[in-house]
Amino acid sequence: LRPSRVHNSEENTMRALTLKDILNGTFSYKTFFPNWISGQEYLHQSADNNIVLYNIETGQSYTILSNRTMKSVNASNYGLSPDRQFVYLESDYSKLWRYSYTATYYIYDLSNGEFVRGNELPRPIQYLCWSPVGSKLAYVYQNNIYLKQRPGDPPFQITFNGRENKIFNGIPDWVYEEEMLPTKYALWWSPNGKFLAYAEFNDKDIPVIAYSYYGDEQYPRTINIPYPKAGAKNPVVRIFIIDTTYPAYVGPQEVPVPAMIASSDYYFSWLTWVTDERVCLQWLKRVQNVSVLSICDFREDWQTWDCPKTQEHIEESRTGWAGGFFVSRPVFSYDAISYYKIFSDKDGYKHIHYIKDTVENAIQITSGKWEAINIFRVTQDSLFYSSNEFEEYPGRRNIYRISIGSYPPSKKCVTCHLRKERCQYYTASFSDYAKYYALVCYGPGIPISTLHDGRTDQEIKILEENKELENALKNIQLPKEEIKKLEVDEITLWYKMILPPQFDRSKKYPLLIQVYGGPCSQSVRSVFAVNWISYLASKEGMVIALVDGRGTAFQGDKLLYAVYRKLGVYEVEDQITAVRKFIEMGFIDEKRIAIWGWSYGGYVSSLALASGTGLFKCGIAVAPVSSWEYYASVYTERFMGLPTKDDNLEHYKNSTVMARAEYFRNVDYLLIHGTADDNVHFQNSAQIAKALVNAQVDFQAMWYSDQNHGLSGLSTNHLYTHMTHFLKQCFSLSD
């Protein structure tokens, strides 16, 4: 479903998008993800903030927690205990990094309608969760882990060595949170709550990034974060498991690291419980082309965890790094030893494999010149996954079901023909035993969320269809969008073009390239969006193009691993190649071409502007990386190796933005960065600016005081207003 465009009788009432529309979020959409609490029940927060329980089978619903109770502690979030006795209420949310935040927690007793008094939780808490069965609580406070058998009980302290910026228990340090897990937590309950596993990160030897936070005080604060840049000392990780029934009996037991991993620097990448007495850990060498999956069993006699070599499965890449963006996680089957996992097949496409004894004997479940993307659920007789197989569009996502109970296994696309025009990009959320599931369609039409029967796939009801948005868009001249591909030198370049509403191929239009281009990313996706570039096409008459070049994901390893150890070369070349092809199409004004990007996109846009091609009149880099020596070890080394003479130092040096300062002389360059960017440090832009000044090259710049990598809040409005002015000036468009 795309809202009707301009060819109607009410053409005179149609209006273009305004920048204000975008900044106000006028055309934002809603999704509906049920908070499943059983096979047939889910919770949802109603518009008036009551927490409502829905029973699919009866079609009935009732409130279990009133908005008055929520409001009494200013709660912004909640969590029901699995035994349905208690709810935690979360308030005083205070953001830290991408996923992490601290909050105050209150426990409400649903049986008697009162808050639990006595042995209240300390504040602020870094992470809190219920056990999967009953109502035990695990939480992290001041980098230490605590356990409560019941909400009203006194806590049992599990760890004692937690120290700010030094030792992290149950929560990740900065680099593990952003680049490895990536979550705000690093503790995992066993399926029935018998054991609690947790990670300990030791950051004592990691160099610290320090930056000023100006605030309102007379003297700025200094923010210090242990942050390993490429080649620096990394966190040291250990995994422990404790019996939560008798936590004081033997205390936390360390899980051994596989010998082939422990022989040099390594990472822990994920933990998956299989049963209460079997756990699966994934490890990765610092040189991230070897991953080991280790299945460990509890030994009752020794009260220890045993990880036999026979239960170690090695995943290695000879052409790039292990995995896609991350090494995939296993999904175990009911026999509690075999599992399903996505990794590259012999043809270099990521597919689902079934591993029973060794990786060498893995049975390939999916195959083809497309990729399996996520395994959602494995039941006794079905496996649900997403892929971009349908009609060979890599930027789509459909949900498939493979019957694993029958032979040969049969495959069915659950979503391909549901709302074909409106919906080509799905995700799913399953209830216990996949009895029911919700489908969330992100586009290309207006997003819609629906509820389905897990056995028949029948649609039961619409959960959210964004009717208000549909109505609001009825009198808006939205741009046209097309997704197509270019074939260049045996490389397929998929692109999305956003065209002005009254686009005429015989006319000439200014072109803006929006680029991200990071390894294992995808920008050309069949999703709905009304955003800044929609406005630029709708109101300002620009053509905007997004191109997925070498290094991008879901089209096979040849394209993905092309950038291995060579960041900043092919990503840029492919943007330039695409621009040349767009010029050949005849409707681009080649004197008015710009490029812009954020983060990795800021790096690519900067290098494209400094490529010396003369193609670009101007461009913008927001929070760019400028040298890979400045970015995080885990991310950078995955793709670039180490910045040492005997490894890849030469390309680290060759691929900086600063090395091309001279080439910015003939372009208009706008450089933007937040001074409190914990991720891509302000240092990156400071060094670009210094190099441009030293080369006596004129440029424009904007900093955002105390803003991080997201440039949120009022900065967002200022940012997009500023960039709009810059582009309109570049393209000689009147204000």
Epitope: S38, Q40, E41, L53, N55, T58, Q60, Y62, G113
Partner: nanobody
Framework: QVQLQESGGGLVQAGGSLRLSCAAS????????MGWYRQAPGKQRELVAG???????KYVESVKGRFTISRDNAKNTVHLQMNSLKVEDTAVYYC??????????WGQGTQVTVSS
């Protein structure tokens, strides 16, 4: 609005057994998740056991292995079989949805007294 009527309580010696029943009537079908709750003198009401519409059961630690919750959807009833009763099981027992709705309407309950 749903009406819930508990029955089956009584006086029993420690180690003895009782079977409580709850009859549900009204607009909300008993196929919803149902629970047994209890309130001892001077204490707050607490959950004892719950049963989901698919038959999945949940028990608090103190009654595991002694109490069994079951349901008869055809008759709109939920039962609580209580074996090996202890003095500390003495309380008024109530049934309700699991978890209870807001605002919760509780029935009269049924008194269970366990003597030593």
């Amino acid at each position: 609005q749903v009406q819930l009527q508990e029955s089956g309580g009584g006086l029993v010696q420690a180690g003895g057994s009782l079977r409580l029943s709850c009859a549900a009537s009204g607009t909300m079908s008993s196929i919803n998740a149902m629970g047994w709750y209890r309130q001892a003198p001077g204490k707050q009401r607490e959950l004892v056991a719950g049963i989901l519409s698919d038959g999945t059961t949940k028990y608090v630690e103190s009654v595991k292995g002694r109490f069994t919750i079951s349901r008869d959807n055809a008759k709109n009833t939920v039962h609580l079989q209580m074996n090996s009763l202890k003095v500390e099981d003495t309380a008024v027992y109530y049934c309700n949805f699991f978890p209870p709705p807001v605002p919760a309407s509780w029935g009269q309950g049924t008194q269970v007294t366990v003597s030593s």
